[in-house]
Amino acid sequence: GILNLNKMVKQVTGKMPILSYWPYGCHCGLGGRGQPKDATDWCCQTHDCCYDHLKTQGCSIYKDYYRYNFSQGNIHCSDKGSWCEQQLCACDKEVAFCLKRNLDTYQKRLRFYWRPHCRGQTPGC
């Protein structure tokens, strides 16, 4: 769950998630509403959708702990464990690399962004 995600994001981006991403914009961190503010925020919105999909399948997304390896800058999700664990790892891997791809457009002003300012249509999954 959340411990896996925090560790993976730190390994891939080099940033401490609790200081840089949770929360950020309108979708990074718990919950999410409105139009994403930038590419980094879109990463989190897509990740929310990934989790939502697993929840509809019956996965316990916050409880499941998965195994993975981080080597030479890449994440290798374990082929063992449950289907939910494998898919959860895939969701987290995707958001970690998405955040890394968009480090150059990271905006400090969106850190602790005031959620009531998150307006517009929330993108569908």
Epitope: G58, C59, K63, D64, D79, S82, W83, C84, Q86
Partner: antibody, heavy 113, light 107 residues
Framework: QVQLKESGPGLVQPSQTLSLTCTVS????????MHWVRQPPGEGLEWMGV???????HYNSTLKSRLSISRDTSKSQVFLEMNSLQTEDTAIYFC???????WGQGTLVTVSS | DIQMTQSPSSLPASLGDRVTITCRAS??????LRWFQQKPGKSPRLMIF???NLANGVPSRFSGSRSGSDYSLTINSLESEDLAIYYC?????????FGGGTKLELK
């Protein structure tokens, strides 16, 4: 080491209910998904359903209306129940631990009067 | 549902031949593909996992590859013990699907 073994009746009457048990050892059912797969004589493999490590179940849409999978984690057993059996349900029934690295030896079920 | 189209259904070959079996996925399954070998009266045996990784105890003459939505199992130099039926399996979705099988037999 990891072991899986299916057990149940070899012969079932048409329209009756099939009950199979998969007894496992070497691991805990609360940590792994368990699948049922069947194979009619001379044919290919057909996925039937799964009971996840968290207890949730999913079934093949073609069998959903008559299939039920459950488990007893304390006894390390997974159960398959399928009703309204017909001759085309004659097959070898396998249980397998996800991600399909371990399989039982299979049990032949013949549906005949 | 994701369909796995396996070909050929039958493959006559000679000992020492290099043989290739293919599965095509109807949707993106990434590397969530496994190959199994099954001999008469036996359970399926895992040969390849993650599309390209050799399972424990599998001879190095076996290999797996991927090109887009096409997945292949290759046996470099066929031996008599390799004669069997081979199945692919996708497990990207929670409801996995098998290919129809390929019967590898002597010419």
């Amino acid at each position: 080491q990891v072991q899986l073994k299916e057990s149940g009746p070899g012969l079932v009457q048409p329209s009756q209910t099939l009950s199979l048990t998969c007894t496992v050892s070497g691991f805990s059912l609360i940590s792994y998904d368990m699948h049922w797969v069947r194979q009619p004589p001379g044919e290919g493999l057909e996925w039937m359903g799964v009971i996840w490590s968290n207890g949730n179940t999913h079934y093949n849409s073609t069998l959903k209306s008559r299939l039920s999978i459950s488990r007893d984690t304390s006894k390390s057993q997974v159960f398959l129940e399928m009703n309204s059996l017909q001759t085309e349900d004659t097959a070898i029934y396998f249980c397998s631990r996800y991600p399909f690295a371990y399989w039982g030896q299979g049990t032949l079920v013949t549906v005949s009067s | 549902d994701i369909q796995m189209t396996q070909s050929p259904s039958s493959l006559p070959a000679s000992l020492g031949d290099r043989v290739t079996i293919t599965c095509r996925a109807s949707q993106d399954i990434g590397d969530y593909l496994r190959w199994f070998q099954q001999k008469p009266g036996k359970s399926p045996r895992l040969m390849i996992f993650g599309a390209t990784n050799l399972a424990n105890g599998v001879p190095s003459r076996f290999s797996g590859s991927r090109s887009g939505s096409d997945y292949s199992l290759t046996i470099n130099s066929l031996e008599s013990e390799d004669l069997a039926i081979y199945y692919c399996l996708q497990h990207k979705e929670y409801f996995p699907t098998f290919g129809g099988g390929t019967k590898l037999e002597l010419k």
